[in-house]
């Protein structure tokens, strides 16, 4: 048993039929010695008396809020949560496996630049009685500070019969050095509590590996005289690291016809302009990627040819 936060405790249980469970001793936080009784949740049934209560925790029915009283007055509370271990593996029931980039990916994180700011998100089908707490650090043995905000519900979608809820959190490395080579990864730890169940999820990454620039901005077309060609121009996104001479991007320019089946013309360039043939009813799209490190491409910025 360990303390998650004040008056909230996690009991780790092997989740198979004949497992013995965990003996837990609760102590009433009071100078009182006599006349103390214990109850569980809203029940008025007295479970025991005395300053301590010993319970055998085997099931979710043994978890909950234990309260010690004296003469009708509440003295203190202890909330017991369960963390299930099945076949030696901690349960991962609360969050959905996003399966990208690989199986058992519950947390996904992205950064728009090298400032040390990043966003992580996760998915669940649970709509109520759900809380998350996020901690992060650079490295684990001698951790350097990363500050995370509160996790918030950022999107809801319908997936077949189920509703899916996306939560996200923003974190900022306290003493980020954008130009430095990373040697220790960022660690992100999410505590998830659904009713009486506790689970924890972790992710470990280098900022360089989760970079995904915003799309190029101010995408414009300039027709070239007496030609079907146009000059496409764009700018670095505002959120990208500066100076751009050091934090450089490379770009992919694509001409796409109305039909998805039509052949796409693609041009790669390090410049912020390109000359392409603009077909009728086609659109021109541009996306960006770190020039010197193959992390994710940005989403496309698009403009119609006509």
């Amino acid at each position: 048993i360990w303390e998650l936060k004040k008056d909230v405790y996690v009991v780790e249980l092997d989740w198979y039929p004949d497992a013995p469970g965990e003996m837990v001793v609760l102590t009433c936080d009071t100078p009182e010695e006599d006349g103390i009784t214990w109850t569980l949740d809203q029940s008025s049934e007295v479970l025991g008396s005395g300053k301590t209560l010993t319970i055998q925790v085997k099931e979710f029915g043994d978890a909950g809020q234990y309260t010690c009283h004296k003469g009708g007055e509440v003295l203190s509370h202890s909330l017991l949560l369960l963390h299930k271990k099945e076949d030696g593996i901690w349960s991962t029931d609360i969050l959905k496996d996003q399966k990208e980039p690989k199986n058992k990916t519950f947390l996904r994180c992205e950064a728009k630049n090298y400032s040390g700011r990043f966003t992580c998100w996760w998915l669940t089908t649970i709509s109520t009685d759900l809380t998350f707490s996020v901690k992060s650090s650079r490295g684990s043995s001698d951790p350097q500070g990363v500050t995370c905000g509160a996790a918030t519900l950022s999107a809801e979608r319908v997936r077949g019969d189920n509703k899916e809820y996306e939560y996200s959190v923003e974190c900022q490395e306290d003493s980020a050095c954008p130009a430095a080579e990373e040697s220790l990864p960022i660690e992100v730890m999410v505590d998830a509590v659904h009713k009486l169940k506790y689970e924890n999820y972790t992710s470990s990454f280098f900022i360089r590996d989760i970079i995904k620039p915003d799309p190029p901005k101010n995408l414009q077309l300039k027709p070239l005289k007496n030609s079907r060609q146009v000059e496409v121009s764009w700018e670095y996104p505002d959120t990208w690291s500066t100076p751009h001479s050091y934090f450089s991007l490379t770009f992919c320019v694509q001409v796409q016809g109305k039909s998805k089946r039509e052949k796409k013309d693609r041009v790669f360039t390090d410049k912020t302009s390109a000359t392409v043939i603009c077909r009728k009813n086609a659109s021109i799209s541009v996306r960006a990627q770190d020039r010197y490190y193959s992390s994710s491409w940005s989403e496309w910025a698009s403009v119609p040819c006509s």
């Epitope: 989740w15 198979y16 085997k58 099931e59 979710f60 009713k195």
Partner: nanobody, 125 residues
């Protein structure tokens, strides 16, 4: 979508046995206390038995103690009710119910969140 599907009911002579099954889908089965309830014609629904998520805690109605056994197989997402020494007064529709993070001493139907459609058990004398 949560589904509880009972099976195994039927007509049996007094003193005989039946085994009811309830297959669950759409829930994290081992997190759920599973209960069996029954309703005889013209009577209130009554609690029969309950089993906690791991199977380590059980509860029975006094009327079935020593005759009925509740069990579960979490690998098959199924709960069972083995009914021996059946009596005519056991005749009823038997319902399976689920309560996430529930307690076995929940004997009120209102404490359970999910219900099956029921299976008929008839004991003839």
């Amino acid at each position: 979508e949560v589904q509880l599907v009972e099976s195994g009911g039927g007509l049996v002579q007094a003193g005989g046995s039946l085994r009811l099954s309830c297959a669950a889908s759409g829930i994290i089965f081992s997190d759920n206390t599973m209960g069996w309830f029954r309703q005889a014609p013209g009577k209130e629904r009554e609690f029969v038995a309950a089993i906690a998520g791991r199977g380590s805690r059980l509860n029975y109605a006094d009327s079935v103690k020593g005759r009925f056994t509740i069990s579960r197989d979490n690998t098959k997402n199924t709960v069972y009710l083995q009914m021996n020494s059946l009596k005519p007064e056991d005749t009823a529709i038997y319902y399976c119910a689920a309560k996430p993070y529930g307690r076995v001493y929940y004997t009120e139907g209102s404490n359970y969140d999910y219900w099956g459609q029921g299976t008929q058990v008839t004991v003839s004398s």
